[in-house]
């Protein structure tokens, strides 16, 4: 058993049928010695008396808010949550496996640049009685500071019969140098509590591996005289790290016909312009990627050919 | 990217081309190592990230773009003195900081070159003959060093009398390649920045 926060405790249980559970001793936070009784949640049934209460915690029915009273007055509370260990592995019931980029990916994180700011998100099908708390650091043995905001509900989607809820959080490394070569990964830890179930999820990454630039901005077409060709031009996104000559991007320019079956013409360039043939009803799209470290491509920025 | 690429002008800066070749070569070598050594811990998540140049060179600090020198998190008090002549410096633009930066890069390359050559000698003794260093990568390191053209004492190749532990050697190769790839990215960024300025 360990303390999650004041008056909230997590009981770790080896979870299998007929398991013996864990013996827990609760102590009433009071100078009083006599006439103390204990109850669980809203029930008025007295579970025991005295300054301490010893309970055998086996199942969720044994978890909840234990309260000690004296003469009708509440003295203190202890909330017991359960953390299930199933065959040596902590349970992951609360969050959905996003399966990207690999199986058992519960937290996904992205950064728009090298400033040390990043966003993480996760999915769940649970809509109520759900709380999250996020902590982060650079490294784990001698951790350096990363400050995270509160997790917020960022999207709701319907997937088949189920509703899916996306939560996200923004974090900022306290003293980040965009040019630094990372040798210690960022660690992100999410505590999730659903009713009386506690779970924790972690992710470990280097900012360089989660970079995904915003799409190029100001995408424009300039027709070339007496030609089917057009000059496409664009700019680096505002959110990208500066100076751009140091934090350079490379670009992919795509000409896509109206039909998805039509052949796509693609050109790669390090410049912020390219000359392509603009077909009728086609559209031109451009996306960006760090020129020197191949992390994710940005989403496409698009303009119609006409 | 096996599709048409609009190639940029080589520019005035002779080292840019070499640094781009270096990054390409080390990235290919790392990819090859990860595939060949699939049963070894060779991925970024599995290895310890060690920097053999730590406390010996200060490339990131010495080569910091002017725009980032205002960022206190980027300024490290490490001071390292370097020789300051080199053919990549366009004489008019030669500045003390730029010379420090390029000599720091040269020292990095020299250190990695020695490590890689020592390691290759061990790998050649492996009866499994599972993996060797790409000669192209070693050649590209050499070319960039020549382009930088700094006078510096030659570091003798480390020789070891004890029987090599091939498992440890292969894991060390992965660690070195990951670190060298990160340094090659920094070198490429620096060359691109210097080329633009």
């Amino acid at each position: 058993i360990w303390e999650l926060k004041k008056d909230v405790y997590v009981v770790e249980l080896d979870w299998y049928p007929d398991a013996p559970g864990e013996m827990v001793v609760l102590t009433c936070d009071t100078p009083e010695e006599d006439g103390i009784t204990w109850t669980l949640d809203q029930s008025s049934e007295v579970l025991g008396s005295g300054k301490t209460l010893t309970i055998q915690v086996k199942e969720f029915g044994d978890a909840g808010q234990y309260t000690c009273h004296k003469g009708g007055e509440v003295l203190s509370h202890s909330l017991l949550l359960l953390h299930k260990k199933e065959d040596g592995i902590w349970s992951t019931d609360i969050l959905k496996d996003q399966k990207e980029p690999k199986n058992k990916t519960f937290l996904r994180c992205e950064a728009k640049n090298y400033s040390g700011r990043f966003t993480c998100w996760w999915l769940t099908t649970i809509s109520t009685d759900l709380t999250f708390s996020v902590k982060s650091s650079r490294g784990s043995s001698d951790p350096q500071g990363v400050t995270c905001g509160a997790a917020t509900l960022s999207a709701e989607r319907v997937r088949g019969d189920n509703k899916e809820y996306e939560y996200s959080v923004e974090c900022q490394e306290d003293s980040a140098c965009p040019a630094a070569e990372e040798s210690l990964p960022i660690e992100v830890m999410v505590d999730a509590v659903h009713k009386l179930k506690y779970e924790n999820y972690t992710s470990s990454f280097f900012i360089r591996d989660i970079i995904k630039p915003d799409p190029p901005k100001n995408l424009q077409l300039k027709p070339l005289k007496n030609s089917r060709q057009v000059e496409v031009s664009w700019e680096y996104p505002d959110t990208w790290s500066t100076p751009h000559s140091y934090f350079s991007l490379t670009f992919c320019v795509q000409v896509q016909g109206k039909s998805k079956r039509e052949k796509k013409d693609r050109v790669f360039t390090d410049k912020t312009s390219a000359t392509v043939i603009c077909r009728k009803n086609a559209s031109i799209s451009v996306r960006a990627q760090d020129r020197y470290y191949s992390s994710s491509w940005s989403e496409w920025a698009s303009v119609p050919c006409s | 990217r096996n599709l048409p690429v609009a190639t940029p002008d080589p520019g005035m800066f002779p080292c840019l081309h070499h640094s781009q070749n270096l990054l390409r070569a080390v990235s290919n070598m790392l990819q090859k190592a990860r595939q060949t050594l699939e049963f070894y811990p060779c991925t970024s998540e599995e290895i310890d990230h060690e920097d053999i140049t730590k406390d010996k060179t200060s490339t990131v600090e010495a080569c910091l773009p002017l725009e980032l020198t205002k960022n206190e998190s980027c300024l490290n008090s490490r001071e390292t003195s370097f020789i300051t002549n080199g053919s990549c410096l366009a004489s008019r633009k030669t500045s003390f900081m730029m010379a420090l930066c390029l000599s720091s890069i040269y020292e990095d390359l020299k250190m990695y070159q020695v490590e890689f050559k020592t390691m290759n000698a061990k790998l050649l003794m492996d009866p499994k003959r599972q993996i060797f260093l790409d000669q192209n990568m070693l050649a590209v390191i050499d070319e960039l060093m020549q382009a930088l053209n700094f006078n510096s004492e030659t570091v003798p190749q480390k020789s070891s009398l004890e029987e090599p532990d091939f498992y440890k050697t292969k894991i060390k190769l992965c660690i070195l390649l990951h670190a060298f790839r990160i340094r090659a990215v920094t070198i490429d960024r620096v060359m691109s920045y210097l080329n633009a300025s």
């Epitope: 299998y16 049928p17 007929d18 398991a19 592995i89 | -």
Partner: antibody, heavy 115, light 112 residues
Framework: QVQLVQSGGGVVQPGRSLRLSCAAS????????MHWVRQAPGKGLEWVAF????????YYADSVKGRFTISRDNSKNTLYLQMKSLRAEDTAVYYC????????WGQGTMVTVSS | SYVLTQPPSVSGTPGQRVTISCSGG????????VKWYQQLPGTAPKLLIY???QRPSGVPDRFSGSKSGTSASLAITGVQAEDEADYYC????????????FGTGTKVTVLG
């Protein structure tokens, strides 16, 4: 004490269907994940499928994906394995099993796929 | 499709020490725990060892388990006639959990 009693096995022709049941007692069935494991005659153990305590997630071995469906009825304390498009290579003793560091197995039920 | 490799058979005379190996990889035994089962002819498997080296109550202390790197082993010190059975190791792959990975199985023969 914990008990898992299996039923539903038998002889079936290739391409036909069969449903196995596993009735649980002696524990809170709705709190625990459950597996199906099979063993072909004279061969080793092969995992078939898993279902979460609440039925929300199901996992299958590649060899049965798209043909077998694991399900549970927590109100009846029963685990099921619906097997469709049966093949000769599905011939085996099928076991249900609880998920956890200490596990309990059903007695097994024989499924024979033969024409 | 078996990723955990066991020797097909091992044998010993009563009182001898018998060991069974189970060889896996970094993503299964290397990053998780191992169980061992005993299966007597015509019966369901019985748990002998969980969590690499833990014995459930009721399992004789002549059975012991260990794990090192990407391999595990089961030792029977002072093997007895009633230990003649098939033995299976089991683990999980970190990418496909909760799918169970079973070893190929080992037939233990106790020589008269």
């Amino acid at each position: 004490q914990v008990q898992l009693v299996q039923s539903g096995g038998g002889v079936v022709q290739p391409g036909r269907s069969l449903r196995l049941s596993c009735a649980a007692s002696g524990f809170t069935f709705s709190s625990y994940g459950m597996h199906w494991v099979r063993q072909a005659p004279g061969k080793g153990l092969e995992w078939v499928a898993f279902i979460r305590y609440d039925g929300s997630n199901k996992y299958y071995a590649d060899s049965v994906k798209g043909r077998f469906t694991i399900s549970r009825d927590n109100s009846k304390n029963t685990l099921y394995l619906q097997m469709k498009s049966l093949r000769a290579e599905d011939t085996a003793v099928y076991y249900c099993k609880t998920h956890g560091s200490h596990d309990n197995w059903g007695q097994g039920t024989m499924v024979t796929v033969s024409s | 499709s078996y990723v955990l490799t066991q020797p097909p058979s091992v044998s010993g005379t009563p009182g001898q020490r018998v060991t069974i190996s189970c060889s896996g990889g970094r993503s299964n035994i290397g990053s998780g725990t191992v169980k061992w089962y005993q299966q007597l002819p015509g019966t369901a498997p019985k748990l002998l060892i969980y969590g690499n080296d833990q014995r459930p109550s009721g399992v004789p202390d002549r059975f012991s388990g260990s794990k090192s790197g990407t391999s595990a082993s089961l030792a029977i010190t002072g093997v007895q006639a009633e230990d003649e059975a098939d033995y299976y190791c089991q683990s999980y792959d970190r990418g496909t959990h909760p799918a169970l990975l079973f070893g190929t199985g080992t037939k233990v023969t106790v020589l008269g």
